[in-house]
Structure formats: C-alpha cells, structure tokens
C-alpha cells in the first residue's frame, strides 16, 4: 500500500479467484484512543471499532473510502483505490490501445520543435468518475525537471457504437537545449483514476524522435508565363525552431488530381518554391520534414490549381 | 447508456439445470464487466459471480462455486449463467448487471441493471 496523495491510498493487488487478498491496516488520524468506529462509504455498518482498523483487500468491494467517528463525529477518511495485477500484467483496463505506432501504445506524444515543448494525448471510452494526474522528467535516475499542465478533454468522437473521448496534457521541459545532442530520454508518467481503480501508464522518448513540424504557411502559386507550369512557393511554419539555417526542414510537393486514383507527381526539395506542373482540378499540397533526422512529416498545407 | 434484458427464468426440480441469458444493446457492450446478482422475497441482493470484459477471468461467490458458470459472447452482446445441481435456495429474482470493476461482489459497483428473471426450485 501506498499514498497516491493526501489520504488517499493505493492498494497493489496481485489477483486470481480465491487469492488471499492483501492485509491492510488503516489507522485513524486522531489523538482520541477511544470510543471510535469505523463505516465504509455512505454506509452506516459499523466494521470495525479501534484507533486501528485491519481489513484484508481481496476486490473493490473492498475499496472505498472508510471514515472512522466518535461520538457521531467525523475524525478522518482514508480512500482506498486498488491497482490491480492480473497473471502477472498491470491493468490497463482505462486507457485504449491506439495501437500505433505499435501495439500497447496507450500515450502518443508529439513536438513542434526543439523548445522542450510537447503535447501527449491518450483515448478512453470512459465518460466519467475519471481523473489523471501527469508528470514528467528528463532521466529517471538523476531526473531533470519537465512541468506538464493539467490533462484537459480535447476531442469526442463516435466510433461504431462507441464515443470515444481524447484527453491531452502539454509538458515544458524546464532548462531545455534546443541545439543538444539528447542523450537521456523524457519519461512520461500518467496515474488513471477511474472510480475506485488506479492504473499508471508510462512513455519513454527523445524530442528528436517525437518532432512533427507544423504545415509550412503561406502556401502560394504564380503561374509561368505561356506554361502549364506554376511557381509553389511557402514559408517554414511559425512554429518551427530557430534559426532555420539550423533547424533546417526538407518539403514533398504533391500534385494530386481530383480523383484519389489519379497519378501522383511528387517532388522533394530542401528550398522553399519549386515548379512543377498544374493540372485541371488538381491541387498542390506541400508537407515538411526535419531535413537532417527522420521524424515525422508534418500534415499537408494544400492549394487548389484553378 | 446500456439497456440489458434476462431471459432463460422458469421453474425446474432441484438436482437439474438451467441457463440464463442477458442480453445488451446500447453501447458497446465489450467495455463492461458483467455480473450476476440475486435477491429472494425478504432479502438482500446478493452477488452471484461476474465476468471480466473480454471473458477471461470469472469470479463467484462461495455460495454457487462449482455449480454456477458466467460466460459471455461479445460478438452477440450477451452473458450467460449457467446454473447446474441447483437446489431450493437458489430460488430468487436473478438480475444481470454491468460495470467498470472486476472483480467486486458489491452491487453499486455495477452502473446498469436488467429488470430480472425468477428461477424457482422445487423441492
């Protein structure tokens, strides 16, 4: 057992059927020795009477929040959760497996740039009596500090007969290095409280490995004098690090057709224009990289040709 | 919101069998834990047994070990009780229900409720 935070208390529980439970002993905050009762929840059955109360935790029925009284007054409340082990595995019963980009992939995070900023998100199909509580660091064992904000409700959406909700946190790293070579990884640590159960999910990353740079802006065509052919020419988005000379980004120029099953033409230059061939009710679409490591791309900022 | 209907309820002999069924609609029926309660004329809703949500791991009370078995098919939204060797004092009202925690005998762990199903055994 231990304390999640100010009287309340987290119960590991390694469970199969007819397992022994976990013996827990609960002691009530008080410097009254007699006359003191204790009830679980809105209960008013008394379980037990005593400064201390030994419970064995073999289920949530077992978890709540016990209060010990005296005399019809209140003294103080311990709120048991359970974070529960099955077959050896850590519940993950909160969060939903987004699956990529592999398999039990629960935090997905991203960055624009190299500042020490960055954005985690994760889904659930829970609605409600849910909670997350988000910290961060850089290393584990001589941590340097990250400061994340509060997790906050992003998006819903409906899939299949399911809604879905998407929650993300923003994170600072606290003494970033934009032009450092990394070489301890984030940590990411986000504790789930879902009514009475506790979960802790877990995410390890380099900045450079989470970068997704905003769309390049500004995105423009000026048509060739007697030519089918256009200028495109964009800016590096806002949002990217400074300067560019350094934090330099790589762009695809698309051309696409109306129709999916059109040809694509594609182009990979490292300026910020190329020419290329406009076609009727085609359109131009322009995405960027980081030019020296593979991350990922960024979305793509489009234009029609017309 | 989750909508569940029991069926399968009746009167048998006691030593014989039954199975009850409890059937979803609503939303996706795979998020929930699933269980089985039962309250006879004069007493508490007592716990029966419940599934966990993908239908690996099973949990009973003392009192139907042996003789009772959950099962569920998350393809067709449906739990099943499977009652065997009943005797006279598994007769009650048998309610389904679904939840978020797994396991817990503790009926207000369970969010939704079917409206229930009699199992009568005679002696």
């Known amino acids: 057992i231990w304390e999640l935070k100010k009287d309340v208390y987290v119960v590991e529980l390694d469970w199969y059927p007819d397992a022994p439970g976990e013996m827990v002993v609960l002691t009530c905050d008080t410097p009254e020795e007699d006359g003191i009762t204790w009830t679980l929840d809105q209960s008013s059955e008394v379980l037990g009477s005593g400064k201390t109360l030994t419970i064995q935790v073999k289920e949530f029925g077992d978890a709540g929040q016990y209060t010990c009284h005296k005399g019809g007054e209140v003294l103080s409340h311990s709120l048991l959760l359970l974070h529960k082990k099955e077959d050896g595995i850590w519940s993950t019963d909160i969060l939903k497996d987004q699956k990529e980009p592999k398999n039990k992939t629960f935090l997905r995070c991203e960055a624009k740039n190299y500042s020490g900023r960055f954005t985690c998100w994760w889904l659930t199909t829970i609605s409600t009596d849910l909670t997350f509580s988000v910290k961060s660091s850089r290393g584990s064992s001589d941590p340097q500090g990250v400061t994340c904000g509060a997790a906050t409700l992003s998006a819903e959406r409906v899939r299949g007969d399911n809604k879905e909700y998407e929650y993300s946190v923003e994170c600072q790293e606290d003494s970033a290095c934009p032009a450092a070579e990394e070489s301890l990884p984030i940590e990411v640590m986000v504790d789930a409280v879902h009514k009475l159960k506790y979960e802790n999910y877990t995410s390890s990353f380099f900045i450079r490995d989470i970068i997704k740079p905003d769309p390049p802006k500004n995105l423009q065509l000026k048509p060739l004098k007697n030519s089918r052919q256009v200028e495109v020419s964009w800016e590096y988005p806002d949002t990217w690090s400074t300067p560019h000379s350094y934090f330099s980004l790589t762009f695809c120029v698309q051309v696409q057709g109306k129709s999916k099953r059109e040809k694509k033409d594609r182009v990979f230059t490292d300026k910020t224009s190329a020419t290329v061939i406009c076609r009727k009710n085609a359109s131009i679409s322009v995405r960027a990289q980081d030019r020296y490591y593979s991350s990922s791309w960024s979305e793509w900022a489009s234009v029609p040709c017309s | 919101e989750v909508q569940l209907v029991e069926s399968g309820g009746g009167v048998v002999q006691a030593g014989e069998s039954l199975r009850l069924s409890c059937a979803a609609s609503g939303r996706s029926f795979s998020n929930y834990e699933m269980g089985w309660f039962r309250q006879a004329p004069g007493t508490e809703r007592e716990f029966v047994g419940s599934?966990?949500?993908?239908?690996?791991?099973?949990y009973y009370a003392d009192s139907v070990k042996g003789r009772f078995t959950i099962s569920r098919d998350n393809a067709k939204n449906t739990v099943y009780l499977q009652m065997s060797s009943l005797k006279p004092e598994d007769t009650a009202v048998y309610y389904c229900a679904a939840g978020w925690l797994y396991p817990s005998s503790r009926s207000r762990d369970y969010d939704y409720w079917g409206q229930g199903t009699q199992v009568t055994v005679s002696s």
């Open positions: 599934i966990n949500r993908r239908g690996s791991s099973t």
